[in-house]
């Protein structure tokens, strides 16, 4: 028996993945549920099995094709259904029409690397992953640097208001260990949100030259 307040939230990674989370107060943990995707103008449909991620929350990824294939466009509408097994039949729990390019969340940036490091500055580059060519240059980035003795939450956010896949960090302390993260967001979409943060890149600034002021 499934009742109570439910919530169904999905995001499109701009290429071939729709990730969904369904939560239901009072749902049984062992309830078998799935998400079914029916695009309005495609010949394919797709299903994924919702797996528990917390006490009353389930998640799954609709894999629409090869990771870099462009499976949906700005004119597509996908009807998403949550179905849960009740005895021998499936019961529809939620129905949502979903415009993929209004609900974007890209993959985290990858391939972070230190291009050049000095005593007080460091140049870092990265790449975006599985991002649609439709965006052209209409992307923005946020970056943050973890300093010794601080937390990620305390790190100030650096905003790059254009598609710039590098940054020059300045006013760093010599011979100090830092970590760096970046995330990306398209400019379009009613519910578009930031990607997850990239894996942290650790780097160390060069020591100050002996006999010189720091």
């Amino acid at each position: 028996a499934v009742n109570g307040t439910s919530q169904f939230t999905c995001f499109y990674n701009s290429r071939a993945n729709i990730s969904c989370v369904w939560s239901q107060d009072g749902a049984l943990q062992d309830t078998s549920c799935q998400v079914h995707a029916w695009p309005d103008r495609r010949r394919w449909n797709q299903t994924c099995e919702l797996l528990p991620v917390s006490q009353a929350s389930w998640a799954c990824n609709l894999i629409l094709g090869a990771p870099d294939s462009q499976k949906l466009t700005t004119v597509d509408i996908v009807t998403l259904r949550v179905l849960c097994r009740e005895g021998v039949r499936w019961r529809v729990m939620a129905i949502q029409d979903f415009k993929p390019f209004e609900n974007l969340r890209l993959m985290a940036p990858i391939s972070l690397q230190v291009v050049h490091v000095e005593t007080h500055r460091c140049n870092i580059s990265w790449e975006i992953s599985q991002a649609s060519h439709y965006f052209e240059r209409h992307l923005e980035f946020e970056a943050r640097t973890l300093s010794p003795g601080h937390t990620w939450e305390e790190a100030p956010l650096l905003t790059l208001k254009q598609k710039q896949e590098w940054i020059c960090l300045e006013t760093l302390t010599p011979d100090t260990q830092y970590e760096f993260q970046v995330r990306v967001k398209p400019l379009q979409g009613e519910f578009t949100t930031w990607s997850p943060w990239s894996q942290p890149l650790a780097f160390r600034t060069k020591p100050a030259a002996l006999g010189k002021d720091t």
């Epitope: 439910s6 169904f8 949502q96 209004e102 609900n103 009613e190 519910f191």
Partner: nanobody
Framework: QLQLVESGGGLVQAGGSLALSCAAS????????MGWFRQAPGKEREFVAA????????MYAVSTEGRFSCSRDNAKNTVYLLIKNLKPEDTAVYYC????????????????????WGQGTQVTVSS
Amino acid sequence: QLQLVESGGGLVQAGGSLALSCAASGGTFSSYAMGWFRQAPGKEREFVAATTRGGGRTMYAVSTEGRFSCSRDNAKNTVYLLIKNLKPEDTAVYYCAARTSYYDGTYYPASSDFDIWGQGTQVTVSS
């Protein structure tokens, strides 16, 4: 304040289709989430569909069985409800409603979440 006027209702044979419209005036239409509700004779008003301010997400009552389609055109200040394969049990007064507070289209809203209502349009399905 936004005013809503529904149109497109009427008498239809079972199996037919109908397109309902709801025209808004007197406010910034794109600032409102929009919903459709219906009330059959002797029954409570029930949720049919709700769409977000930009139309990026639209939730449907599970009872709609994929026969209903809700869309909006912010340039025309209008929200639509297309009903296919009509059944006698679809007979009801259909109401358009607007919601001032934010709605993200991830859950089923209650009728009390909507603060502006149209006068309704009658849909009668004959068998």
